[in-house]
């Protein structure tokens, strides 16, 4: 004989379990339904009654089977340095991503606690390593044969160009600069230009002045180039 | 207020290890480079090691490569440097920095008050 | 290793003096060259970056100046507050050396 089917609520067997999409409810000791996606548990179920679900208000989400009483918050709008990749709706959470030419210095479960701006290279310096969703970019010094006249998170470091007859030696932060002929420019293998990198979830404010220095100390810290510029955190 | 607090120095036997910690609040630490720099009893600086912000890119000083490693915790602001293998040369004043921005922003901005570490039988 | 050879190693001099330290690199260091200050029983401090630009409330008497592999720090008017060792160092490749410092005293 085929096996009954058992609708909720009802007593699982001794040492059993309750099927996918089923709870087990302490007070009435029953299997009964969990709420989907988008809805919450507004009557949790007796021995006689299943689960009552609700639709998530406004600004609330529940994102899987569930039995809370309470849809979760979305998380507070995006702030105006942030892009929306993920609106809030019942069924899912509102996703911020750090903008383009930021990266995620520190992730939290979902998305990013604090964005900081991508490192700029400057002059003599170029990028050794790209920035990506989650890192920043690593700089080097240009070596010799190489330079970098630019203050970027994306270029690398290019070869000088071959002069026929050399007008001006380049160096780390300046090209050669060549006499009327015209010159050539030597292989550098890859691209001069690195794309930026692709955004993350992230929460963060606009960058922040550098900070004042320890106490008790009779110079602050420099004004010139700045450190990095960081978001608050985003809790 | 930016404030590094180094940790862990005290007195060793050549050959031995010690652990430095430094830990750090007042900025956002995951977003800076740090480095450790000691000094001789001579009063000489020297640079030991850097580890920039996310932990991808150290470098070291060619008397402590092989011997010593720098690592971070974001999470917990702290900052470390694993000394083995120690030599009598070690013996220094160790200084937890910030900086530098490599390649940005070149210099050291803020200094802890040091640990000393002693390397004698 | 780029060298730094700091100059003099010490000197004594009177409040109201004017001094300058100087620092050559052996190779160029494209301007990547901080100063430190440090006082007896203190860490040192950031007092020029760049070479030529003052760390945020360092006063005007200092000032830093370049010429080719040759780096100066040079401070009007000795104050009180001014006498410790001062450091340069360079930001160029690995490793990142610093002079051997100079121990400015109070005549």
């Known amino acids: 004989l085929p096996a009954q089917v058992a609708f909720t609520p009802y007593a699982p067997e001794p040492g059993g379990t309750c099927r996918l999409r089923e709870y087990y409810d302490q007070t009435a000791q029953m299997c009964c339904s969990k709420c989907p996606p988008g809805q919450h548990a507004k009557v949790f179920c007796t021995k006689t009654s299943d689960t009552v679900c609700d639709s998530c208000e406004d600004s609330t989400y529940t994102q899987l089977w569930n039995w809370v009483p309470e849809c979760l918050s979305c998380g507070s709008r995006c702030s105006s340095d942030q892009v929306e990749t993920q609106a809030c709706t019942r069924e899912q959470n509102r996703i911020c991503t750090c903008r383009p030419g930021w990266y995620c210095a520190l992730s939290k479960q979902e998305g990013c606690r604090l964005c900081a701006q991508l490192r700029k290279c400057r002059p003599g310096f170029g990028v050794a390593r790209p920035g990506t969703e989650t890192s920043d970019v690593v700089c080097k010094p240009c070596a010799p044969g190489t330079f970098s006249n630019t203050t970027s998170s994306t270029d690398i470091c290019r070869p000088h160009q071959i002069c026929h007859v050399v007008a001006i030696p380049g160096n780390a932060s300046m090209d050669a600069v060549c006499t009327s002929t015209s010159p050539t420019r030597s292989m550098a293998p890859g691209a001069v230009h690195l794309p930026q990198p692709v955004s993350t979830r992230s929460q963060h404010t606009q960058p922040t002045p550098a900070p004042s220095t320890a106490p008790g100390t009779s110079f602050l810290l420099p004004v010139g180039p700045s450190p990095p510029a960081e978001g608050s955190t985003g809790d | 207020e930016v404030q590094l607090q180094e940790s862990g120095g005290g007195l060793v036997q050549p050959g031995g290890s010690l652990n430095l910690s430094c830990a750090a609040s007042?900025?956002?630490?995951?977003?800076?480079?740090l480095s450790w720099v000691r000094q001789t009893p001579e009063k000489r600086l020297e640079w030991v090691a850097y580890?920039?912000?996310?932990?991808?890119?150290?470098y070291y000083s060619d008397t402590v490569k092989g011997r010593f490693t720098i690592s971070r915790d974001n999470a917990k602001n702290t900052l470390y440097l694993q000394m083995s293998s120690l030599k009598s040369e070690d013996t220094a004043m160790y200084y937890c920095v910030r900086g530098p921005f490599y390649g940005s922003a070149n210099y050291f901005d803020y200094w802890g008050q040091g640990t000393t570490v002693t390397v004698s039988s | 290793e780029i060298v730094m050879t700091q100059s003099p190693a010490s000197l004594s001099l009177s409040v109201g003096e004017t001094v300058t330290i100087t620092c050559r690199t052996s190779?160029?260091?494209?301007?990547?060259l901080p100063w430190y200050q440090q006082k007896q029983g203190k860490s040192p401090q950031l007092l020029v970056y760049d070479a030529t630009k003052l760390a945020e409330g360092v006063p005007s008497r200092f000032s830093g100046s370049e010429s080719g592999t040759q780096y100066s720090l040079k401070i009007n008017s000795l104050q009180s507050e001014d006498f410790g060792t001062y450091y340069c160092?360079?930001?160029?490749?690995?490793?990142?050396?610093f002079g051997g410092g100079t121990k400015l005293e109070i005549k």
């Open positions: 190779e160029s260091i494209y301007s990547n």
């Open positions: 160092q360079h930001f160029w490749v690995t490793p990142w050396t």
């Open positions: 007042g900025f956002a630490f995951s977003t800076y480079d």
């Open positions: 580890i920039n912000n996310g932990g991808i890119s150290t």
